[in-house]
């Protein structure tokens, strides 16, 4: 039987007469078109809904848009387009809400051909009220606010100039020309590419990277030859062009640009492209890909300064620069990731790891699934997992996967059970334990979003005709119950639900057509009453991440520690509440070669654990430069894990010496760094 | 071989007080929950709590709430439950016992290994 | 509290019989339900875990099935050995909770 049918399922008490009382309707009084919604700080229930309708005439496109904004978590809606004036919004910069809980909401109008610069609406009280400011520019992007300071913004015009505003775009003022692309850094730091000749297209490979701490009063170029930069974790990142050739190389800093190391990693082509598929203060995971049109690429596991880097998987499926690749962080459980591999055979398999890139395997097969035709052995299979390039394929698949940090262990995600990625209708799996187990949890494709810490998981079937039923199950999946929550179906678009997973209320939304119209319509639905009570210390039960074996004093050691969660027992049916912090308990674990990568010069043979040192370089000092100097690394080859906590057991030794020799690894080396003031 | 070995039998007066140790051997003793189970002459089995020796954490049925203590010396791989307030009717034998675990998950699987027990007598 | 009701309280069965011990839950467990057996004198000793799971090291003649709230453990063909007290004990809500007992003695 499918899941959640079996008879041992427990119902949930009277739950159509709970919902049927906290089920809200509004229908839009809009012509169909185009929808957005964002939601305004951190537990507010604030929302802004956004709708468009073009029409296009023969010279021209007539668009008309409305806002609506609800103050109760979608429930009610009042239309506050007169706020703005009736003004057209641009939906392409969408709407720009502020950091944190700052209550700010920038809008985007289209402006009529002739005029001098754009137009914004802007509010800082939660979008009660808006102000109408006219641009001494033309916005070419959607206005960036600083992640320290919600006042600080900034935006590129259609003439390419970096435009600054320190009073939360009242004034504006542009702080240089000729900028490719600017990016906020830490305290306030402003990160920026610039051409000297032409255009950023025709100058890529020789631009500039510019600096300034000050918004704009001083400026320190930090870069040159850039063909591109970006920002992860701690980590500033570059690519440049090599003196020679065409090839481009990437190159690290952590003190925002005031001193390089070239990055230990393979220098790429014209049509290559570098990505930084994550970044967190310890370390980062870096895409190379291969040369020629393959589609794939390499996985590099960084050192905690982003310059030693480890091999972590081959043929990577990266499709092209900016293209797709289904590397996913699973952030219900530390150090795991999931993401796909192009086989010899063209095939698409799903790999996981659970030690932040030290080793991928296949994700096990659920128990209650059978392998399918792409299986060679009916009785030997994984499961795969559909993600980001699945969904650019069009194949059959709503969602990517999803996990949130205060839903501890679970994930859940399209799949197929066979041998590779299947392109069949695919299932809805669940993991309760990061990803090392599966099981079936619905059949067919659908919506899926985690409410109250994962106390309640709701979804809705992916069909082409109206829908008017919502499954939920608050057991994690195991049990199902089926809500009718309207008579007359709706053209479903989309769930949508606070972010952060802690709301009980979740949005369906979608159209219902008439003969002559057809009108954007909401259901708001309140799972309060389904979870009555608060959960109690007894509603929680212990669990152990990453346990694989309880007889093995190291079980649960990951990155050099475990932790003991507290999680909810599947039996409970309480609310884990707005306020749930996730409770855990770490305890260091003895360090063993697992918990060290191999230092520069040493690389790790398959399947053994111990790093030896890389024939071309044995011999050989070890020199390397790092920060602009020559330095001499004396290595048994192992260089600690970014992150990890371990203690006590295995100690490689290590010594790095500086000496004092300049070096400049195709860069500009400090010295030769400029500085300017306005 | 994995095993649990309880400290000798007591004899107490009403009011006072009984420590009973169950030290661990054979397996990782932070691994796995400490239950405490107590049986009076010719009774079932009554469950008293448990603690988590990796944390110190405890687990206590609110039939003993106030009167129980439940420790460990993770050291020595040894937990100690100590009943306060004695009274004739906790005259029982009392058992430690290990929680069985399910990969990651403490508790749902019963107890799997059992120390021999220590008889407590509670007489004026 | 969750109550924990066990049948028959006590039994008479002779070697080679099939024995069948039922336990009811007051409310639904799931599957989170586990038997022991216990002779005079000693520590009980796990038979089944999670209502049908064979605790290693157990004569696969013991079986336990059942979910939500009805449960049962099975003896396939009683042996001289099983002569002993059978309890269920449920772990799914604290506090955890024994039936009665049954005691299977010889015909």
């Known amino acids: 039987s499918a899941p959640g049918e079996d008879e041992e399922c427990g119902r949930v008490r009277d739950f159509v007469a709970k919902l049927a009382n906290n089920t809200h309707q509004h229908v839009f009084d809009d012509l169909r078109g185009s929808v957005s919604l964002s939601w305004v700080g951190d537990s507010t229930g604030v929302i802004l809904v956004l709708t468009t309708f073009h029409v296009p005439l023969v010279i021209m496109t007539f668009g008309q848009s409305k806002l609506y904004r609800s103050e109760d978590y979608g429930k009610n809606f009042k239309d506050i387009t007169d706020l703005i004036n009736n003004t057209f919004i641009r939906t392409e910069f969408g709407m720009a809400i502020g950091p944190e809980n700052s209550g700010k909401v920038v809008l985007t109008a289209e402006v009529s051909g002739g005029s001098r610069g754009g137009r914004i609406f802007r509010s800082s009280d939660f979008a009660k009220n808006f102000v109408q400011t006219d641009l001494p520019f033309h916005p070419l992007t959607q206005m960036m606010y600083s992640p320290q300071n919600s006042d600080y913004l900034l935006a590129l015009s259609t003439e390419n100039g970096l435009w600054v505003s320190k009073n939360f775009g009242g004034k504006w003022e542009e702080i240089h020309k000729a900028v490719c692309l600017a990016k906020w850094g830490s305290d306030n730091t402003i990160f920026f590419t610039t051409y000297a000749n032409g255009s950023c297209k025709a100058d890529l490979g020789a631009l500039e990277l510019w600096r300034t701490s000050d918004l704009g009063k001083s400026f320190k170029t930090i870069g040159v030859k850039i063909y591109s930069f970006g920002l992860g974790g701690r980590f500033l990142f570059a690519s440049v062009m090599a003196d020679k050739d065409t090839t481009r190389r990437i190159h690290v800093s952590t003190d925002q640009g005031d001193t390089w190391s070239m990055a230990q990693l393979p220098s790429v082509g014209q049509e290559q492209f570098y990505s930084i598929l994550a970044a967190n203060d310890d370390m980062v995971f870096m895409h190379v890909d291969e040369p020629g049109d393959t589609g794939f690429g390499t996985i590099f596991t960084s050192d905690d300064r982003g310059i030693v880097y480890s091999k972590s998987l081959d043929r990577h499926l990266y499709t092209t620069t900016g293209g797709e690749t289904d590397f996913t962080n699973v952030t219900s459980l530390r150090g795991v990731y999931i993401t796909s591999v192009l086989s010899e055979d063209n095939s698409i398999q799903t790999m996981i790891t659970f030690d932040q890139g030290g080793r991928w395997t296949h994700l096990r097969k659920p128990e209650n699934s059978e392998c399918d035709a792409t299986a060679k052995n009916k009785n030997e299979c994984s499961l795969h997992i559909h993600a980001s390039y699945s969904i650019s394929q069009k194949l059959n698949v709503p969602m990517a996967p999803l996990s949130e940090p205060n839903a501890v262990g679970i994930v859940i995600a399209h799949g197929s059970v066979g041998d590779a990625i299947s392109v069949m209708v695919p299932d809805v799996y669940i993991s309760d334990d990061g990803g090392y187990s599966w099981t079936k949890m619905l059949e067919g494709p659908h919506y899926y979003t985690i409410l109250d810490s994962g106390g309640i998981i709701v979804a809705i079937e992916h069909s082409s005709r109206p829908i008017n039923v919502i499954k939920f199950s608050t057991d994690e999946g195991q049990c199902w119950q089926t809500y009718t929550f309207t008579r007359d179906p709706i053209y479903f678009t989309g769930l949508a639900s606070e972010p952060g997973a802690r709301s009980m209320n979740i949005s369906i939304w979608g159209f219902t057509e008439s003969f002559l119209t057809s009108q954007w319509v909401s259901y708001t639905i309140d799972f309060k009453d389904i979870l009555e009570r608060n959960c109690e210390e007894k509603d929680y039960t212990i669990w152990l991440a990453h346990s694989t074996d309880p007889e093995d004093y190291e079980d649960g050691c990951i990155l050099g520690y475990k932790e003991q969660f507290l999680r909810l027992r599947k039996s409970s049916v309480c609310q884990n509440g707005r306020d749930y912090v996730v409770t855990k308990q770490p305890s260091i674990c003895l360090c063993s070669l697992e918990d060290f990568l191999c230092d520069f010069g040493y690389y790790r043979p398959e399947n053994d654990s111990k790093c030896v040192e890389q024939p071309e370089l044995k011999g050989h000092d070890l020199e390397f430069c790092l920060y602009g100097r020559e330095e001499h690394l004396t290595t048994n080859g192992y260089r600690k894990i970014p992150g990890d906590k371990c203690q006590g057991g295995v100690n490689p030794v290590r010594e790095v010496k500086d000496l004092k020799k300049k070096c400049t690894s195709n860069f500009l080396s400090p010295e030769k760094q400029n500085s300017k003031s306005n | 071989q994995v095993q649990l070995v309880q400290s000798g039998a007591e004899v107490k007066k009403p009011g006072a007080s009984v420590k009973v140790s169950c030290k661990a051997s054979g397996y990782t003793f932070p691994g796995y929950l400490m239950h405490w189970v107590r049986q009076a002459p010719g009774q079932g089995l009554e469950w008293m709590g448990w603690?988590?020796?990796?944390?110190?954490?405890?687990n206590y049925a609110q039939k003993f709430q106030g009167r129980v203590t439940m420790t460990r010396d993770t050291s020595i791989s040894t937990a100690y439950m100590e009943l306060s307030r004695l009274r004739s009717d906790d005259t029982a034998v009392y058992y430690c016992a290990r929680g069985k675990r399910s990969s990651g998950w403490y508790e749902g699987y019963g107890m799997d290994v059992w120390g021999q027990g220590t008889t407590v007598t509670v007489s004026s | 509290d969750i109550q924990m009701t066990q049948s028959p309280s006590s039994l008479s069965a002779s070697v080679g019989d099939r024995v069948t011990i039922t336990c009811r839950a007051s409310?639904?467990?799931?599957?989170?339900l586990n038997w022991y057996q216990q002779k005079p004198g000693k520590a009980p000793k796990l038979l089944i875990y999670?209502?049908?799971s064979l605790q290693s090291g157990v004569p696969s003649r013991f079986s336990g099935s059942g979910s939500g709230t009805d449960f049962t453990l099975t003896i396939s063909s009683l042996q001289p050995e099983d002569f002993a007290t059978y309890y269920c004990?449920?772990?799914?809500?604290?506090?955890?909770?024994f039936g009665g007992g049954t005691k299977v003695e010889i015909k």
């Open positions: 004990q449920q772990s799914d809500v604290s506090p955890i909770t």
């Open positions: 999670a209502a049908s």
């Open positions: 409310q639904s467990i799931s599957s989170y």
């Open positions: 603690i988590n020796p990796v944390s110190g954490s405890t």
